[in-house]
């Protein structure tokens, strides 16, 4: 394969090239500049289904379209999970499947998709209004979630699309760490561009075809991003609720995790709040929440006393620290 | 509003026992977290983490109660135990059940992101 990389900077181009070189090498950052801002945004997808078999019985499926690895799929009912939503099965891809009543059976289709069937009877049952939540945990994206419920009209057997409508919960660390990287390359990619427009072609006929290039817009939002700053966050309120109590159906694979420390070493960072963003919605339910582990709001007030090193005479309340609130 | 309550705490002499309990309860839904963990805090002292259990069951402690204090889930996923045994009185101290998500389910490395708190319950060892 051929590319202008390879043709020496003072060897005039060949007869017949010139304009197609000078048209190629405007459109290739265009081209790179467009998949600078359209990468990094995986999405989710949501497909509930009523079992034709068992007017109770839902099967709900959820996938991730991204490249990264997930490390944790949540799957809810009556709303993202933490704000409302009531878990119903947890899969990691080495742990094992958690799920609880009324799931029945949560598995793993890919590695990047699982279904998970409900059996409806008694108190804990689903019905048709219910909004069921997949949450995604994936590196370096972050977490990604999206919702979906039957359709009011749906006949048994049938499925509602699957919904690709992320809540886009995008950990602080994915977010930034990939936003960084493509921001650089594209900062990059503009600076290469500037360079060069702006050097002299030594020695080379003028192009007769280089009309003065538009100047790049890096990551300027588009209108749908730029009016979902002000979409309110909207949330179903189904009247359909899960029980609040019921009986786990443990799966658990084997048991490691990470060492919790016995005593701080450091002062670290503190949890960041969950900054709500929403933006408009394509399913059924969307918001946006960027952070760590916390949704704004959602911690009591005078909570967790704080990790330190230094003892405080005054106890754990007059303390600060990242296990508490400021 | 996600609430955190203790208890099982009290006095209790060296070499004795006691079984520590932390509900957390949810206004509307059935709150799961991925990580619940014991603190504690003695008098004078900083914080210590005491035990950490995530939602797949994944258990670790510190080092100064390996092989006397056992934490423990319930099956529904929302309720926190801690069986303490072999009690010395160096274990004196305010102890306070913590719970929060993080992305992978387990329990993160020196708390962060546990956002809920009970408002713990004493434990006193003493003859």
């Known amino acids: 394969m051929r590319t202008e990389a390879q043709v020496p900077a003072l060897q005039p181009p060949e007869p017949g090239l010139e304009g197609a070189m000078g048209h190629r090498t405007l459109v290739l950052p265009w081209v790179l500049l467009t998949l600078c801002v359209t990468a990094g945004t995986p999405e989710v997808w949501v497909q509930v289904r009523m079992e034709a078999t068992e007017l109770s019985s839902f099967t709900i499926r959820c996938g991730f379209l991204g490249s990264g690895s997930i490390s944790l799929v949540t799957v809810s009912w009556g709303g993202p999970n933490g704000a409302g939503g009531t878990t119903l099965a947890v899969l990691h891809p080495e742990r094992g499947i958690r799920q609880w009543a009324p799931a029945r059976q949560a598995r793993w289709e890919t590695q990047s998709s699982i279904s998970l069937i409900l059996e409806g009877s008694g108190a804990s049952s689903p019905c048709a209004n219910t909004t069921f939540c997949c949450k995604f945990a994936s590196f370096p994206e972050g977490s990604w979630e999206a919702c979906g419920s039957l359709p009011p009209s749906s006949d048994p057997g049938l499925s509602a699309p699957p919904t690709p409508a992320p809540i886009l919960r995008a950990d602080l660390a994915g977010i930034l760490g990939v936003s960084g990287v493509l921001l650089f390359g594209c900062v990059y990619l503009l600076h290469l561009l500037r360079r060069h427009k702006h050097r002299p072609a030594p020695r080379l006929q003028p192009s007769r075809t280089s009309p003065q290039a538009p100047r790049a817009r890096a990551w300027a939002p588009s209108q749908a991003s730029q009016a979902a700053l002000h979409v309110p966050y909207a949330t179903i309120n189904t009247s359909c609720r899960p029980a609040t109590l019921d009986t786990a159906h443990p799966h658990g694979g084997p048991s490691w995790w990470a060492s919790l420390p016995t005593h701080a070493a450091h002062r670290p960072q503190g949890p960041a709040a969950w900054a709500s963003t929403p933006i408009p919605a394509r399913g059924s339910f969307v918001s946006v929440e960027n952070g760590l582990y916390a949704q704004a709001g959602e911690r009591p007030p005078h909570t967790g006393p704080g990790l330190t090193l230094f003892p405080d005479p005054r106890g754990p309340r007059a303390m600060e620290g990242p296990l508490g609130v400021r | 509003h996600v609430q955190l309550v203790e208890s099982g705490g009290g006095l209790v002499q060296p070499g004795g026992s006691l079984r520590l309990s932390c509900v957390a309860s949810a206004s509307g839904f059935t709150y799961r977290p991925y990580c619940m963990a014991w603190f504690r805090q003695a008098p004078g002292k900083g914080l210590e983490a005491v035990a950490g259990?995530?939602?797949?069951?994944?258990?670790t402690y510190a080092d100064s109660v390996k092989g006397r204090f056992t934490a423990s889930r319930d099956n529904a996923g929302f309720s926190l135990y801690l069986q303490m045994n072999s009690l010395r009185a160096e274990d004196t101290a305010v102890y306070y059940c913590?719970?929060?998500?993080?992305?992978?389910?387990?329990?993160?490395?020196?708390?962060?992101?546990?956002?809920?708190w009970g408002q713990g319950t004493m434990v006193t060892v003493s003859s």
């Open positions: 913590a719970a929060g998500d993080s992305p992978d389910g387990r329990c993160p490395p020196l708390g962060q992101g546990l956002n809920y």
């Open positions: 259990i995530d939602i797949f069951g994944g258990t």
